[in-house]
């Protein structure tokens, strides 16, 4: 899947831009926005009728290194009376983001971009139920 | 930056920290080509904290289109189909990282970009307090 | 700890309005949504109105539609609900609700009287 070229016509190719080797991009790993601080919403994983947990995947030859995966905790949902309801079901919400990822051939490091899937969290939903002759 | 192992037989010239600017092979290693929420699943119809799709465009962003949820209603839907306005149908927001061009325009330069995303939205049991 | 100052409650005649407002204070930082219940005697607490911080979506509850309306006032953390072409069935007790997505805040109440 390659990045699409900028192909609007009310583009302009500045004079300023870096020069490319053929077949690559440069890519700045300076994050925008990376000290920007967000208000999550407090333990929403714990409260949710669908609750989750979470694990820190780590891998030094990724960038970021630190991937944080979310896992139901159930299978069903958490009814009024804090019981698990298997009548319906507890289903992961995924997200896709972008990581570098450096490969290593011989002595030589190469940087390849990588599209990997996020769990973000779970929702309650209602299944489809389907009777099997 | 990150430390990462490094082959004991390779010249000691190799940074061990990923350098502020690399040069990317412009193939993304990627088996999830799916990006539409819509088509990947159902679930933003049959969750309990149903939500709507909106369609963030940018062309100097990769990728240029993100799909952000907005929940439905402020409660949840019970059993019977109605709103419970004593639950809460919440976003569940993340963080991800996308492409911006850098300078502006140029088709092969580009920086990361660390976005807030809401994903979908969950029911959530709020602790209640009487205020005196 | 947070706050909520509810006003505007009294007595009205049937066909006659009426603007509650209730200001939040203190630890009132990250709102998912500020709206009214209400409780009439002898009834369960019901939603009546209520208005999501982030986009100002509005939701009602079928029996107030097009007769309320609820606003805010962000820079005051104020929430306003006006409410026109008053009832007798719209006598009850408005309870001001401030939601933190897992925290809920209610307010102690307003009385709301609509009688000729």
């Known amino acids: 899947r390659k990045i699409p070229k900028v192909g609007h016509t009310f583009f302009q190719k500045p004079e300023s831009c870096p020069p490319v080797p053929g077949g690559s991009m440069k890519l700045d790993i300076g994050i925008i926005n990376e000290n920007q601080r967000v208000s999550m919403s407090r333990n929403i994983e714990s409260r949710s009728t669908s609750p989750w947990n979470y694990t820190v995947t780590w891998d030094p030859n990724r960038y970021p290194s630190e991937v944080v995966q979310a896992q139901c905790r159930n299978l069903g949902c958490i009814n009024a009376q804090g019981k698990e309801d298997i009548s319906m079901n507890s289903v992961p919400i995924q997200q896709e983001t972008l990581v570098v990822r450096r490969k290593h051939q011989g002595c030589s490091v190469s940087f390849q971009l990588e599209k990997v899937l996020v769990t973000v969290g779970c929702t309650c939903v209602t299944p489809v139920i389907h009777h099997v002759q | 930056g990150i430390t990462i192992p490094r082959n004991p037989g390779c010249p000691n010239s190799e940074d061990k920290n990923f350098p502020r600017t690399v040069m990317v092979n412009l193939n993304i290693h990627n088996r999830n080509t799916n990006t539409n929420p819509k088509r990947s699943s159902d679930y933003y119809n049959r969750s309990t904290s149903p939500w709507n799709l909106h369609r963030n465009e940018d062309p100097e962003r990769y990728p240029s289109v993100i799909w952000e949820a907005k929940c439905r209603h402020l409660g949840c839907i019970n059993a019977d189909g109605n709103v419970d306005y004593h639950m809460n149908s919440v976003p569940i927001q993340q963080e991800i990282l996308v492409l911006r061009r850098e300078p502006p325009h140029c088709p092969n330069s580009f920086r990361l970009e660390k976005i807030l995303v809401s994903v979908g939205c969950t029911c959530v049991t709020p602790i209640v307090h009487h205020v005196a | 700890e947070v706050q909520l100052v509810e006003s505007g409650g009294g007595s009205v005649q049937p066909g006659d309005s009426l603007r509650l407002s209730c200001a939040a204070s203190?630890?009132?930082?990250?709102?998912?949504?500020f709206g009214w219940f209400r409780q009439a005697p002898g009834k369960e607490r019901e939603f009546v109105a209520g208005?999501?911080?982030?986009?100002?979506?509005?939701e009602y509850a079928n029996s107030v539609k097009g007769r309320f309306t609820i606003s805010r006032d962000n820079s005051k953390n104020t929430v306003y609900l006006q409410m026109d072409s008053l009832r007798p069935e719209d006598t009850a007790v408005y309870y001001c609700?401030?939601?933190?997505?897992?925290?809920?805040?209610w307010g102690q109440g307003t009385l709301v009287t609509v009688s000729s």
């Open positions: 609700v401030l939601d933190l997505s897992t925290v809920r805040y």
């Open positions: 208005i999501r911080w982030s986009d100002a979506y509005t």
């Open positions: 203190g630890r009132a930082n990250s709102i998912n949504w």
